[in-house]
């Protein structure tokens, strides 16, 4: 167990041209607050996926009123740290989202209004117990400067907060096989209570005899890296031999959602849909009022004046969830054309186009014939984002640069012999056959079946195919 701590140093205009307008004015004074969302591993940074490591809201900053004509300065910030407690091991790699929110304090009907000013996201590696890490992130014309760290809560220590420390029983040294707990040199590492052989790097335990794995590791001793590439089922528990996830109980079995929340499986875990008044990964957080700003993404909070009365978030179009924290899946309408892959980035839809297509919705079939010449009189033919050449007689290959052997396909029927000719091919027919391809038998009475031989040309003469 431990705490992730975030210290916001400044939020204001970034360098370069196009300084943003101040978010507050004399007519609409406002104050800022921040929300941080943490997810384990290098997971997707989509704002609507659950903050599985935890989330926190800052206090409100001081009220700010823009001075007329002055450029937007760094805005006054809330006091204190944002703290996100984590119950399990610190994962070492994590994704974060930091949102800057504006609370307008004008005389709006129904109380203050909230709007999202900026959202930054990133993926980082961080060992618990290390020094503060500094970061600068830009969102549009805004710049956010902050520091963060993860620290373990006693008795936990270590880079993942999985080792336990206890006060020394003897003043001089620790017991046999137990090391001092740096940096708490007056404490000793607690006796190992995990299952024997449990990986010290990738496993941890909270109960004697168990071995729980950090993300990306599996097996009874957490020694097998997870590899789902050759696996069929998306569910655990894990196979100790292959590292494959094999069928087992679903993540919603036993309903991990508290306070009447309903559980739905996601590709990697589960998701709780919480009743009003509750939020958190397992709907475990309650006592929230509208003053806490529980509605995200511009949702309007109504009711909930005190912790005993539930609030309601009225979500703007495109958002849902009891706290407007989830985005509606707009990609399910399949807006991308020509097999493009749809990505919902939150502020916009993006299409990743297949080769040969372009445009915001992959609507443009790239003209592959543009600037592509087919040699020797060939013509370029479009098709499916690729091009091919339809070659003139006697030529072949991708660009009609290769001289084709017209006799390669054995065009002369009934044993006729083929001769290449500058304008095509000539068939010398076997006795009893005639025609450009020796396709017509000559009747015994001398009359051909079809067509009649041209004047001056006897059956059996070579016939040139024009």
């Amino acid at each position: 167990a431990g705490v992730f701590e975030l210290q916001i140093h400044s939020f204001g205009p970034g360098p370069g041209p196009g300084a943003p307008r101040s978010p507050c004015s004399a007519r609409l004074p406002c104050r800022l607050f921040f929300r941080v969302c943490l997810k384990p591993g290098l997971s997707e940074e989509a704002a609507e996926s659950p903050c599985a490591l935890g989330a926190a809201l800052s206090a409100r900053g001081p009220v700010y009123t823009e001075q007329p004509g002055a450029p937007a300065p760094d805005l006054p910030l809330p006091d204190g740290l944002l703290q996100v407690p984590f119950r399990d091991a610190w994962p070492g790699t994590f994704s974060f989202i930091i949102e800057t929110w504006r609370e307008e304090l004008g005389d709006q009907i129904g109380g203050p209004a909230w709007s999202l000013l900026a959202r930054v996201a990133g993926r980082r590696r961080l060992a618990a117990g290390g020094p503060w890490a500094r970061d600068i992130q830009r969102a549009g014309a805004w710049e956010l400067r902050f520091s963060y760290r993860a620290r373990c809560e006693p008795p936990a220590v270590g880079t993942a907060c999985t080792r336990l420390c206890r006060p020394r029983s003897a003043p001089s040294r620790c017991g046999p096989g137990l090391r001092p707990c740096a940096p708490l040199e007056d404490e000793c590492e607690a006796p190992l209570v995990c299952r024997a052989g449990c990986s010290p790097e990738h496993g941890f335990c909270e109960q004697p005899g168990e071995c729980r794995c950090l993300e990306g590791w599996t097996g009874p001793l957490c020694t097998v890296p997870v590899s789902t590439s050759s696996c069929l089922s998306p569910r655990g528990p894990s196979s100790a031999t292959t590292g494959c996830l094999v069928p087992g109980p679903g993540p919603c079995d036993g309903n991990p959602c508290a306070n009447g929340g309903s559980c739905s499986e996601t590709p990697r875990s589960f998701e709780c849909t919480c009743p009003r008044g509750f939020y958190g990964l397992r709907c475990e957080v309650s006592g929230v009022t509208c003053a806490d700003g529980p509605c995200f993404n511009g949702g309007l909070c109504v009711g909930g004046a005190d912790p005993d009365s539930a609030y309601i978030c009225h979500c703007p179009p495109g958002f849902q969830g009891s706290n407007c924290e989830k985005r509606v899946d707009r990609c399910s309408l399949q807006p991308c054309r020509n097999g493009g892959l749809c990505l919902d980035l939150g502020h916009a839809l993006r299409c990743r186009c297949r080769a040969g297509f372009a445009g915001p919705r992959c609507e443009h079939d790239l003209d592959d014939c543009a600037g592509r010449a087919c040699a020797n009189g060939g013509t370029c033919v479009e098709g499916g984002g690729a091009h091919r050449c339809s070659c003139a007689l006697g030529f072949g290959g991708r660009d009609c640069r290769e001289r084709a052997d017209p006799c390669a396909a054995r065009p002369c029927a009934h044993g006729g012999r083929c001769y290449a000719h500058f304008s095509g091919l000539v068939c010398a027919c076997a006795p009893g056959y005639m025609g450009a391809r020796c396709e017509f038998p000559v009747h015994p009475d001398g009359a051909s079946a079809l067509p009649a031989a041209p004047p001056g040309l006897r059956p059996g003469d070579p016939q040139r195919y024009l």
């Epitope: 179009p317 495109g318 707009r330 309408l333 399949q334 807006p335 991308c336 054309r337 020509n338 493009g340 839809l349 915001p360 919705r361 992959c362 609507e363």
Partner: nanobody, 120 residues
């Protein structure tokens, strides 16, 4: 600005039918994709039926054979004919459209929703 206006919702008995309409208006150069979503109380919003960017029709598994989507391109309007309605079809039905504006940008828009209630 683009507006999507839904109509046709109401209360109906199980087995009954309703026809929803959604008309798009505003600075629209073209409509790329358009269709219907629904959201039942306490549930996630889900796609019901639509015309994709490629012009194909798609349906949620739960409504196939019962709902039919159609459109009038001249009026920038889509319709959802709902037959053999069931209690589980009760929801707010939202029109959605991916639109190319006169600026040539694409934007995704939502209607305000129309309530469909199926009860005996």
């Amino acid at each position: 600005e683009v507006q999507l206006v839904e109509s046709g919702g109401g209360e109906v008995q199980p087995g009954g039918s309703l026809r929803l309409s959604c008309a798009a208006s505003g600075s629209i150069l073209s409509i790329n994709a358009m269709g219907w979503y629904r959201q039942a109380p306490g549930k996630q919003r889900e796609m019901v039926a639509g015309f994709t960017g490629d012009g194909n029709t798609i349906y949620a598994e739960s409504v196939k054979g019962r709902f039919t989507i159609s459109r009038d391109n001249a009026k920038n309007t889509v319709y959802l004919q709902m037959s053999s309605l069931r209690a589980e079809d009760t929801a707010v039905y939202y029109c959605a459209a991916d639109v190319q504006l006169f600026s040539r940008d694409y934007e995704f828009y939502w209607g305000q929703g129309t309530l469909v209630t199926v009860k005996p």
